[in-house]
């Protein structure tokens, strides 16, 4: 003898987050009379998703007109799917009863899986700057994806990195997942223009991975090299001494001139020149009135770069004999006409 069966033809349905899921259900008979209900999960803790008879289910629409008595299609559509909607959905036929309807037959269930895109990877570097030859750690995080399978790669200037560790959480079943990866990068003096890239590939991205980037310019500190030179005499009794501050990054730099240990002038790097590698050069000069000094003068160029302890370079200025020829006597210390032209 024929008896009503509830057919859920789809064992599983895969839907992208934000889209609409269609869960199909057909009853093979119009009798017994009674409503259909949809549940997520089975057993006493199951969640009511739709009740044909009563209730308000704003995200659910029926595919067919359930008010028509000859309808056998009890499929539903659930709008604006999120990973939290994942689960097994059951179409259940009830038989009209008094006072309550009685559960009559259930479908085999349809597993709804939600494909959710990972969020844009966020790459963060160390809190403090580090100098070349040091190893620094970068972290990359992406959240909210499903299914769990995901691939993460690290690159530095297009070259794939191998020294990293990645975790996907949680380990067990979940509606959505997060990935966290830490990569170790050795800094070089040429890294001002370098980029570290975290690349995430997931089934939802259709072969177009998401990328997060960090500029090493935010991480690196290249300390300056100093050179103090004495220039030819510019005027009667005056000597021009320059301090070349080379290959530093970032630009934040303060220079102090000391004459025999006493502060003569302090200035902040302003009109710098940029090198191809992104580092900066700067020059400061000091006019020393030789006639004001009876003894030799020790000139010190002291540089405080990016809040670090000061570095300095000194130069002994001899004032005892032939002040007019002083410049020519020390011309060998001149670093070249290019620097002379800067000021």
């Amino acid at each position: 003898e024929e008896e009503l069966q509830v057919i859920q033809p789809d064992k599983s349905v895969l839907v992208a987050a934000g889209e609409t899921a269609t869960l199909r259900c057909t009853a093979t008979s119009l009798i017994p009379v009674g409503p259909i209900q949809w549940f997520r999960g089975a057993g006493p803790g199951r969640e009511l998703i739709y009740n044909q008879k009563e209730g308000h289910f704003p995200r659910v629409t029926t595919v067919s007109d359930l008010t028509k008595r000859n309808n056998m299609d009890f499929s539903i559509r659930i709008g604006n799917i999120t990973p939290a909607d994942a689960g097994t959905y059951y179409c259940v036929k009830f038989r009209k009863g008094s006072p309550d309807d009685v559960e009559f037959k259930s479908g085999a269930g349809t597993e709804l899986s939600v494909r959710a895109k990972p969020s844009a990877p966020v790459v963060s570097g160390p809190a403090a700057r580090a100098t070349p030859q040091h190893t620094v750690s970068f972290t990359c995080e992406s959240h909210g994806f499903s299914p769990r399978d995901i691939t993460l790669k690290w690159f530095k200037n297009g070259n794939e990195l191998s020294d990293f560790q990645t975790n996907v959480d949680p380990v067990g079943e979940s509606v959505s997942y997060s990935i966290h990866s830490t990569a170790k990068v050795v800094l070089t003096r040429e890294d001002v223009h370098s980029q570290v890239i975290c690349e995430v590939a997931h089934v939802t991205l259709q072969g177009d991975p998401l990328r997060g980037t960090a500029n090493l310019s935010e991480t690196i500190r290249v300390p300056p090299t100093l050179e103090v030179t004495q220039q030819p005499v510019r005027a009667e009794n005056q000597v021009n001494v320059t301090c070349q501050v080379r290959k530093f990054y970032p630009q934040r730099l303060q220079l102090t001139w000391l004459e025999n240990g006493n502060v003569s002038r302090t200035e902040t790097a302003s009109t710098v020149t940029e090198n191809k590698d992104g580092t900066y050069n700067w020059m400061s000069w000091l006019l020393v009135n030789v006639s004001a000094h009876r003894d030799d003068v020790k000139l010190t160029c002291q540089v405080e770069h990016d809040g670090q302890p000061a570095v300095s370079k000194s130069h002994d200025l001899k004032v005892s004999a032939h002040p007019k020829e002083q410049g020519s006597n020390t011309a060998a210390e001149n670093t070249g006409s290019n620097e002379r032209n800067i000021y």
Epitope: L30, V63, S64
Partner: antibody, heavy 122, light 107 residues
Amino acid sequence: QVQLVESGGGVVQPGRSLRLSCAASGFTFSSYGMHWVRQAPGKGLEWVAVIAYDGSNKLYADSVKGRFTISRDNSKNTLYLQMNSLRAEDTAVYYCARTQLKYTLGFAFDIWGQGTMVTVSS
Amino acid sequence: DIQMTQSPSSLSASVGDRVTITCQASQDISNYLNWYQQKPGKAPKLLIYDASNLETGVPSRFSGSGSGTDFTFTISSLQPEDIATYYCQQFTYLPPTFGGGTKVEIK
């Protein structure tokens, strides 16, 4: 007026394929479930397949399951039946028919086409 | 599948006669039963739906009754244009099934 016109029938060898079409006019095709029903020469009527108004649900008679595919193009007001692996016992007049009530997967047929003959013979 | 047994398989009656056809279902199908008329070389036409409801435009000499397993189709006064084969069809259970048909002829 409300009309269904089938086409695509003919003589075909066993194991071969054929596609039937049913052009609908005079009603809102996209609101109705549609069926194929066949009738072997000198025999009674046999239901073959149904498709929901929006194509979301399809059901087949056991005798054609896995061989026949019902589909529709609501933009063209046309119903289709793709028949593969045809057998001699598939020889019949094939009718397309409309479900009586809008937006239902119902099995009362209120409008029928004139039919198209399919002969499966070697 | 639900078996639908129609009787008689054919009948001959005079114009103006009352004609009755019966249809028996192999199990209870409530009142989910339709009656169709098929003239030679033509498509079937719905006459009665839900066992007793007359389809729009169908002459009132056609009627139907019954519920459960036993159903009756009646032509109260046979007309020459009623020469056709009549089929019952249940749509309570899938797949929908038809009776074997009753061929009505004029004496």
